[in-house]
Interface confidence: medium
């Protein structure tokens, strides 16, 4: 399961953020708009979704996941480029099933190293690890057949920002589970 959970040492997770504002808590501000935004969570070392009210707040707020990661995660671009250009299976494909501790009961996919195939599993909605994909296709592109197949494989995935390429957690889409700070 989650050898790469929040408190364990990881390639990126043990490093300090690039800017001091990345350490600020997410601030939704006093206005009442519902704008999907992203912030860098100092505790989890991940960029996460939150709902921004539309005014005030602070600098730890980004319109896209990619922008957040580029700005606040040290070595992110280097790691992403390295992973995208190589055809090896990323290490997290070998992590065991980890449902996390929330109980949102979501249908997800993981790479099963025993069967060498992507399979369905039930995810609780928070925590867990990176061997966790929203679609079977995503899982296959990254773990079953990295660098192969029709499109550009990992490059396509990065371009579309479908997953968060970081240590320590699954994709943060939070269907049931917005963080209101």
């Amino acid at each position: 399961l989650s050898e790469e959970a929040d408190d364990t040492d990881s390639e990126l997770g043990s490093m300090k953020p690039l800017h001091t504002f990345c350490a600020m808590k997410a601030d939704d501000g006093p206005c009442k708009a519902m704008i999907r935004s992203y912030f860098f969570n100092m505790y989890t070392h991940q960029c996460e979704e939150f709902i921004y009210g539309g005014c005030e707040g602070n600098e730890n707020r980004f319109d896209t996941l990619e922008e957040c990661k580029k700005t606040c995660i040290p070595g992110y671009e280097k790691t992403a480029v390295k992973a995208a250009s190589g055809a090896e299976r990323p290490d997290f494909c070998f992590l065991e099933e980890d449902p996390g501790l929330c109980r949102g009961y979501m249908k997800r996919y993981l790479y099963n190293n025993q069967t060498k195939q992507c399979e369905r599993f039930v995810y609780g909605g928070c925590l867990g690890n990176r061997n966790n994909f929203e679609t079977l296709d995503e899982c296959k592109k990254i773990c079953e057949n990295p660098g192969g197949g029709s499109g550009g494989g990992l490059n396509d995935i990065f371009e579309a920002q479908k997953i968060e390429w970081h240590e320590g957690g699954p994709p943060h889409h939070h269907h049931h589970h917005h963080h209101h700070h």
């Epitope: 399961l1 065991e96 449902p99 929330c102 963080h179």
Partner: antibody, heavy 125, light 107 residues
Framework: QVQLVQSGAEVKKPGASVKVSCKAS????????MHWVRQAPGQGLEWMGW????????NYAQKFQGRVTMTRDTSISTAYMELSRLRSDDTAVYYC??????????????????WGQGTLVTVSS | AIQLTQSPSSLSASVGDRVTITCRAS??????LAWYQQKPGKAPKLLIY???TLQSGVPSRFSGSGSGTDFTLTISSLQPEDFATYYC?????????FGQGTKLEIK
């Protein structure tokens, strides 16, 4: 029936280490996390971390990082929690508790549903 | 780290009373909250998980509600065996954390 049976009370000197065991029975040991929680005298509960008995993978609370080691012996269905460099404020009852490692579509189980009886560790010079 | 604040810290009540204990999280935790009962010298016992699901074997006089940051544990009609300390716990993010406890005493 599910049972978690812990080792007996320990008295240790500051700077020493303690290793507490938790023997599981009545279920598939490798199918569930084992969490460790402690409780200082007259105080609340504090989560320390978990081990996945199947892989040996661990997740420790940052507060205990570098001092705690969780291990397991699957052949005897036993989890261990070792705490090193003990201080007087580590005096507490230490509990193991079971957690879910695989969700089913129908929610029929909960985390922390079974607990050991607790092991009192006293740190005193 | 997420802080959980329980109120009240202690409470005196009589058999048959309806009792409510609240737990407030420092940030939203969806419904990732559990409630435990602990008696002196014993391990905690799980009462409620996922904020409102009653654990198997727990009497139906116990109920849980809430989502996000505010949660309640209600005992509809206190029984003599219910006098104990109650804790809430969040399972939304690491480190998992517990409230400071609410001690329920006989009036």
């Amino acid at each position: 029936q599910v049972q978690l049976v812990q080792s007996g009370a320990e008295v240790k000197k500051p700077g020493a280490s303690v290793k507490v065991s938790c023997k599981a029975s009545g279920y598939t040991f490798t199918g569930y996390y084992m969490h460790w929680v402690r409780q200082a005298p007259g105080q609340g509960l504090e989560w320390m971390g978990w081990i996945n008995p199947n892989s040996g993978g661990t997740n420790y609370a940052q507060k205990f990082q570098g001092r705690v080691t969780m291990t397991r012996d699957t052949s005897i269905s036993t989890a261990y929690m070792e705490l090193s460099r003990l201080r007087s404020d580590d005096t507490a009852v230490y509990y193991c508790a079971r957690g879910i490692a695989r969700l089913q579509w129908l929610p029929t189980e909960a985390d922390f549903d079974y607990w050991g009886q607790g092991t009192l560790v006293t740190v005193s010079s | 780290a997420i802080q959980l604040t329980q109120s009240p810290s202690s409470l005196s009540a009589s058999v048959g009373d309806r009792v409510t204990i609240t737990c407030r999280a420092s940030q939203g935790i969806s419904s990732s909250l559990a409630w435990y009962q602990q008696k002196p010298g014993k391990a905690p016992k799980l009462l409620i998980y996922a904020a409102s699901t009653l654990q198997s074997g727990v009497p139906s006089r116990f109920s849980g509600s809430g989502s996000g940051t505010d949660f309640t544990l209600t005992i509809s009609s206190l029984q003599p065996e219910d006098f104990a300390t109650y804790y809430c716990q969040q399972l939304d993010s690491y480190p998992l954390s517990f409230g400071q406890g609410t001690k329920l005493e006989i009036k």
